[in-house]
C-alpha cells in the first residue's frame, strides 16, 4: 500500500491537500523524494474510488499513517512494502 | 441537487421486521457510499453500517450485524434498510447518509424516518 | 470502539458571546473528525471536517481545531439561529461513532 518511486519526472503535485483520508478509503500511496526536478517530497493517494489527490507532506494525519504502515511493514515481512522503480 | 428521499413513518409491533427506503437523486448513485444511522429518543447518533452500491459490499456496525441489513437497488437509485426482531429499543428515528469521497464526513442526509414498535 | 465524550450535554449562552464544545476520544483517531449541528425538527448538517476545515457555506464564526484525542469546536460570535445540539464524530476506524451532543441554549 506504500510505494516509494525515484522519477526523472519534474513535480506530479500542482495542489496538495491536508484532509485526512480514513485507511479504508485508501487503495495505495505513492511516494516521491525531492530531487530529479522536483524539490520537495511528494506524497500521491489514490482512493477506492480511483480518483487521486495529493497529500501534503507536513500533514500530522500522513505522517502517522506511514510510520504505521512501515512498522506493520517491517513485522510482516517478506512481504515489500517500499517498491524502488529507478528510471 | 443532491436529494435523499427517506420512505414515511413506520409504526409496527415486536418481533416484526420493517424496511426503510432512500430514494437519492442529484448525484451518481453508484459512486458513494450510503450511510445509515440510529437516533434514538436519548438523541445520541449512531452509526448502523455503510454500503458501496458499486459492488454491494456491507460495512456493519457490529452492534447491529443482526439487526439490520442494508441492500440497494441501483435501476431506482434507492438504498434499503431491513430491520428484523423489533423490540422497544427499535423505536427510533433512522436516517441515510452519503459518504462524501472529497472529505469522509456524511455530506446529505435524508429527512429521517420514524420507527415506532408498540403493540 | 472509540468512544467520543462531550462533556457538556447543555451549554447556555447569550448572542454574541464565544462558546467552545469540546470532544475527547478514546483513543488516538488523528484527525478524523467531524462536527454536525442538528437544529430542531432536522436532519444533521456536517459544519466542520477533518478536525479544522470548514465545510462549504459554513459561517466563518465557526471553527475547531484539535488532532489526536482532543477536539474544540467554537462558535465566535453566537447567533440566535445557531440554537441546535452539535455532535462529533470520528471517521478514523469502524464503527464510526458520534459524541453524545451538546444542545446550544440562547440565553
Known amino acids: 500500500v506504500l510505494e516509494v518511486y525515484y522519477t526523472s519526472l519534474r513535480c506530479r503535485c500542482v495542489q496538495e491537500s491536508s484532509v485526512f483520508i480514513p485507511r479504508r478509503f485508501i487503495d495505495r500511496i505513492q511516494i516521491l523524494p525531492r530531487g530529479n526536478g522536483c524539490p520537495r517530497k511528494e506524497i500521491i493517494v489514490w482512493k477506492k474510488n480511483k480518483s487521486i489527490v495529493c497529500v501534503d507532506p507536513q500533514a500530522e494525519w500522513i505522517q502517522r499513517m506511514m510510520e504505521v504502515l512501515r512498522k506493520r511493514s517491517s513485522s510482516t515481512l517478506p512481504v515489500p512494502v517500499f517498491k524502488r522503480k529507478i528510471p | 441537487e443532491v436529494q435523499l428521499q427517506q420512505s414515511g413513518p413506520e409504526l409496527v409491533k415486536p418481533g416484526a421486521s420493517v424496511k426503510i427506503s432512500c430514494q437519492a437523486s442529484?448525484?451518481?448513485?453508484?459512486?458513494?457510499?450510503m450511510n445509515w444511522v440510529k437516533q434514538s429518543h436519548g438523541k445520541r447518533l449512531e452509526w448502523i453500517g455503510d454500503?458501496?452500491?458499486?459492488?454491494?459490499?456491507?460495512t456493519y456496525n457490529q452492534k447491529f450485524k443482526d439487526k439490520a441489513t442494508l441492500t440497494v437497488d441501483k435501476s431506482s437509485s434507492t438504498a434499503y434498510m431491513d430491520l428484523r426482531s423489533l423490540t422497544s429499543e427499535d423505536s427510533a428515528v433512522y436516517y441515510c447518509?452519503?459518504?462524501?469521497?472529497?472529505?469522509?464526513?456524511?455530506?446529505?442526509w435524508g429527512q429521517g424516518t420514524s420507527v415506532t414498535v408498540s403493540s | 470502539d472509540i468512544v467520543m465524550t462531550q462533556s457538556h450535554k447543555f451549554m447556555s449562552t447569550s448572542v454574541g458571546d464565544r462558546v467552545s464544545i469540546t470532544c475527547k476520544a478514546s483513543?488516538?483517531?488523528?484527525?478524523?473528525v467531524a462536527w454536525y449541528q442538528q437544529k430542531p425538527g432536522q436532519s444533521p448538517k456536517v459544519l466542520i471536517y477533518?478536525?479544522?476545515h470548514r465545510h462549504t457555506g459554513v459561517p466563518d464564526r465557526f471553527t475547531a481545531s484539535g488532532s489526536g484525542t482532543d477536539f474544540t469546536f467554537t462558535i465566535s460570535s453566537v447567533q440566535a439561529e445557531d440554537l441546535a445540539v452539535y455532535y462529533c464524530?470520528?471517521?478514523?476506524?469502524?464503527?464510526?461513532?458520534f459524541g453524545g451532543g451538546t444542545k446550544l441554549e440562547i440565553k
Open positions: 454500503i458501496n452500491p458499486n459492488n454491494d459490499g456491507t
Open positions: 477533518s478536525a479544522s
Open positions: 442529484g448525484y451518481a448513485f453508484s459512486d458513494y457510499y
Open positions: 464524530q470520528q471517521y478514523y476506524n469502524t464503527p464510526w461513532t
Open positions: 483513543q488516538d483517531v488523528s484527525s478524523g
Open positions: 447518509a452519503r459518504l462524501s469521497w472529497s472529505f469522509f464526513a456524511m455530506d446529505y
